[in-house]
């Protein structure tokens, strides 16, 4: 089962109310990067997995959930240094003996190929080229995600150009 990711879209014409009001836009907050329907924030500091999870929560977001191989590739393309890796929202559930996304869904065998041990206290991180498991207590960078949000800007029609 893949992590469920809400998709949002907006009909530009439907939301155009006045010529002096800009259409609703799907925007990412400042410092966040847009990747299709998500906003991603790549941390600059390092933390154990649990602290990374908590940090994303304080930002009203979650650790990155990866839906499929395409999304993995798109995310990895944003990692410009092959020597830096990031925690994502996937860890090993000892009770269920399976990799589990933080939204409660389980890793499909076709989604990601994880290099490393599947055992207690293992969490997953991604690099530019690979996906690894590591002790959750290891201090690494991390990626938070949130959905695109609607932002309404009132501006003059000239600024539409």
């Amino acid at each position: 089962q893949k992590p469920s990711i809400g998709k949002c879209s907006v009909d530009i014409q439907q939301n155009r109310t006045k010529t002096t009001e800009r259409p609703d836009l799907l925007n990412c907050p400042i410092y966040w990067q847009q990747v299709q329907e998500k906003c991603l924030l790549f941390s600059h500091t390092v933390n154990p997995w649990n602290n990374s999870l908590a940090d994303c929560s304080t930002k009203e977001s979650s650790l990155l959930l990866i839906q499929d191989k395409d999304e993995l590739t798109r995310t990895q393309n944003l990692i410009h240094d092959k020597a830096i890796s990031f925690w994502i929202g996937l860890n090993f559930s000892l009770s269920e003996k399976n990799w589990k996304w933080i939204n409660g869904s389980f890793l499909s065998s076709n989604d990601l190929k994880i290099t490393g041990d599947a055992k207690e206290n293992s969490c997953v991180y991604i690099s530019q080229t690979s996906v690894y498991s590591e002790y959750c207590s290891t201090e690494m960078k991390w990626i938070c995600q949130k959905e695109l949000t609607l932002v309404r800007n009132k501006v003059s029609p000239d600024s539409w150009l």
Partner: antibody, heavy 122, light 108 residues
């Protein structure tokens, strides 16, 4: 300038103690795993100890466990190695080394200091 | 502990030669291997990590290959500054992070 500078080496009698220091500059010290690695005269390299960025995770080689203590002060950009109950076989150049950030506890050492010589002899 | 055996222990070569150094691990270490260069009186320098990734700033004449237990460092065209001792290092998650015994590349 990105660099590591060790200090504190010297001549000490067997059973004695020394405290090595490593001053880091030019990078965000608090984000990196740091290690001590040693090299006996004319010999190969031996990893001694590592410490995680926050200092919460530490590991030692069996040869120094119970005798050496690694620590760090991120506010001072400094790494330390307290060496007690020193033996003749601890004689070596001690290097402070930074690990690549990416690789968790898979410690590849991408930045090294010049080393400080510790001689244990009566 | 995982043991690393380097061969040869020394090699004599000329400028322009292709030099190959091997490192064998006592058990499977996947691709968790690095190569370092050390010159007399100097600290080691990271050349290759993750078995085949070239460290930033290292000339492309250096390359690494292998996985599992058998690894190779190749210098495609030896330069005067390449005469040094080379060490492999395994970095599986569990310490200790052992080094090979070294291979000295000397001028023929």
């Amino acid at each position: 300038q990105v660099q590591l500078v060790e200090s504190g080496g010297g001549l000490v009698k067997p059973g004695g103690s020394l405290r090595l220091s490593c001053a880091a500059s030019g990078f965000t010290f608090a984000q990196y795993y740091m290690s001590w690695i040693r090299q006996a005269p004319g010999k190969g390299l031996e990893w001694v100890s590592y410490i995680s960025p926050s200092g919460s995770t530490i590991a030692y080689a069996d040869s120094v466990k119970g005798r050496f203590t690694i620590s760090r002060d991120n506010a001072k950009n400094s790494l330390y190695l307290q060496m007690n109950s020193l033996r003749a076989e601890d004689t070596a150049v001690y290097y402070c080394a930074r690990s690549l950030m990416a690789t968790g506890t898979h410690l590849y050492f991408d930045l090294w200091g010049r080393g400080t010589l510790v001689t244990v002899s009566s | 502990d995982i043991q690393l055996t380097q061969s040869p222990s020394s090699v004599s070569a000329s400028v322009g030669d292709r030099v190959t150094i091997t490192c064998r691990a006592s058990q499977d270490i996947s691709s968790w291997l690095a190569w370092y260069q050390q010159k007399p009186g100097k600290a080691p320098k990271l050349l290759i990590y993750a078995a085949s990734s070239l460290q930033s700033g290292v000339p492309s004449r250096f390359s690494g290959s292998g996985s599992g237990t058998d690894f190779t460092l190749t210098i495609s065209s030896l330069q005067p500054e390449d005469f040094a001792t080379y060490y492999c290092q395994q970095v599986t998650s569990f310490p200790p992070y052992t080094f090979g015994g070294g291979t000295k590349v000397e001028i023929k």
